[in-house]
């Protein structure tokens, strides 16, 4: 599932390059392993912002699929309460390209520990 999430992120990156979305998004670029579920939640919430701002059907479908995949991969630990983690709004705001790069990095963390 996580490999498919990375495929979807690449697809979103390609789709966005053909558009002009200059949004800045809350981005966790240095994820601590004990906060990775919280960070994933923030990434997914911000992805929905991309979907809404783009108004693009392909981006919308890909984001929705990505959330479904991530949900299923995290169904056993998605409700784990991680303490001492930053709230999404406390994260640094970065452009979409940097946001997606950081997203791929966190997904790779999940792949490495699964």
């Amino acid at each position: 599932n996580w490999v498919n999430v990375i495929s979807d992120l690449k697809k979103i990156e390609d789709l966005i390059q053909s558009m002009h979305i200059d949004a800045t998004l809350y981005t966790e670029s240095d994820v601590h392993p004990s906060c990775k579920v919280t960070a994933m939640k923030c990434f997914l919430l911000e992805l929905q912002v991309i979907s809404l701002e783009s108004g693009d059907a392909s981006i919308h479908d890909t984001v929705e699929n990505l959330i479904i995949l991530a949900n299923n991969s995290l169904s056993s630990n998605g409700n784990v309460t991680e303490s001492g983690c930053k709230e999404c709004e406390e994260l640094e705001e970065k452009n979409i390209k940097e946001f997606l790069q950081s997203f791929v990095h966190i997904v790779q963390m999940f792949i490495n520990t699964s």
């Epitope: 579920v37 809404l52 392909s58 919308h60 479908d61 984001v63 699929n65 169904s75």
Partner: antibody, heavy 122, light 112 residues
């Protein structure tokens, strides 16, 4: 008023195939994900398949995965369910349903068609 | 898979009474983004199911306010404050937080 009309049901032998259709009208079909749900005689509801708005993504339970294929033709406002290798336990009324977006709404099936009966028997 | 268990199987009521249907999931159905995709559907005899409640407590358009949904995590409830004749039928809870999406077994609301 949103309209969904399922058709294509009938009697088919075990191992056979059938294609169900669902004609949609009175809404912008391409703006909605769609699902199929079935109900065996005297039994409860079972989710069968979901397809994304553009048709790129599909989801199935293990009970039908590899045998059933959900697809859509947005130019014809029509949803399909191709059912292969049919079994007696696939006998049911099949409903098509419109899905509200996860991102902009509640991810619920807000309107349902009237259903079409599929009977698998020799 | 998430197992959805509804109780009771059958609920005999008098018109005007309050009715309460319970739905329990085998694991939390709060998704990673914090949403709980739990719906309630009503299927009247000989008809297609109809959406009543989505995301635990949101009433679908046109659904009377005597219907209310509540709950969190794994325990959910549908309440009908004053049962009317048109409310009779089969009620199903449904989770679509995790694939495969799953229905409860159904609760038949009938006249006592």
């Amino acid at each position: 008023e949103v309209r969904l009309m399922a058709s294509g049901g009938g009697l088919v032998q075990p191992g056979g195939s059938l294609r169900l259709s669902c004609a949609a009208s009175e809404f912008t079909f391409s703006n909605y994900a769609m699902s199929w749900v079935r109900q065996a005689p005297g039994k409860g509801l079972e989710w069968v398949a979901t397809i994304s708005r553009g048709g790129d993504y599909t989801y199935y339970p293990d009970s039908v995965k590899g045998r059933f294929t959900i697809s859509r033709d947005n130019s014809k406002n029509t949803l399909y369910l191709q059912m292969n290798s049919l079994r007696a336990e696939d006998t049911a009324v099949y409903y098509c349903a419109r899905r509200v977006s996860m991102i902009t709404g509640g991810w619920a099936m807000d309107y349902w068609g009237q259903g079409t009966l599929v009977t698998v028997s020799s | 898979d998430v197992l959805m268990t509804q109780t009771p199987l059958s609920l005999p009521v008098s018109l005007g009474d309050q009715a309460s249907i319970s739905c329990r999931s085998s694991q939390s159905i709060v998704d990673i983004t914090g949403n709980t995709y739990l719906e309630w559907y009503l299927q009247k005899p000989g008809q297609s199911p109809k959406l009543l409640i989505y995301k635990v407590f949101n009433r679908f358009s046109g659904v009377p306010d005597r219907f209310s949904g509540s709950g969190s995590g794994t325990d959910f409830t549908l309440k009908i404050s004053r049962v009317e004749a048109e409310d009779l039928g089969l009620y199903y809870c449904f989770q679509d937080s995790f694939v495969p999406y799953t229905f409860g077994g159904g609760t038949k609301l009938e006249i006592k």
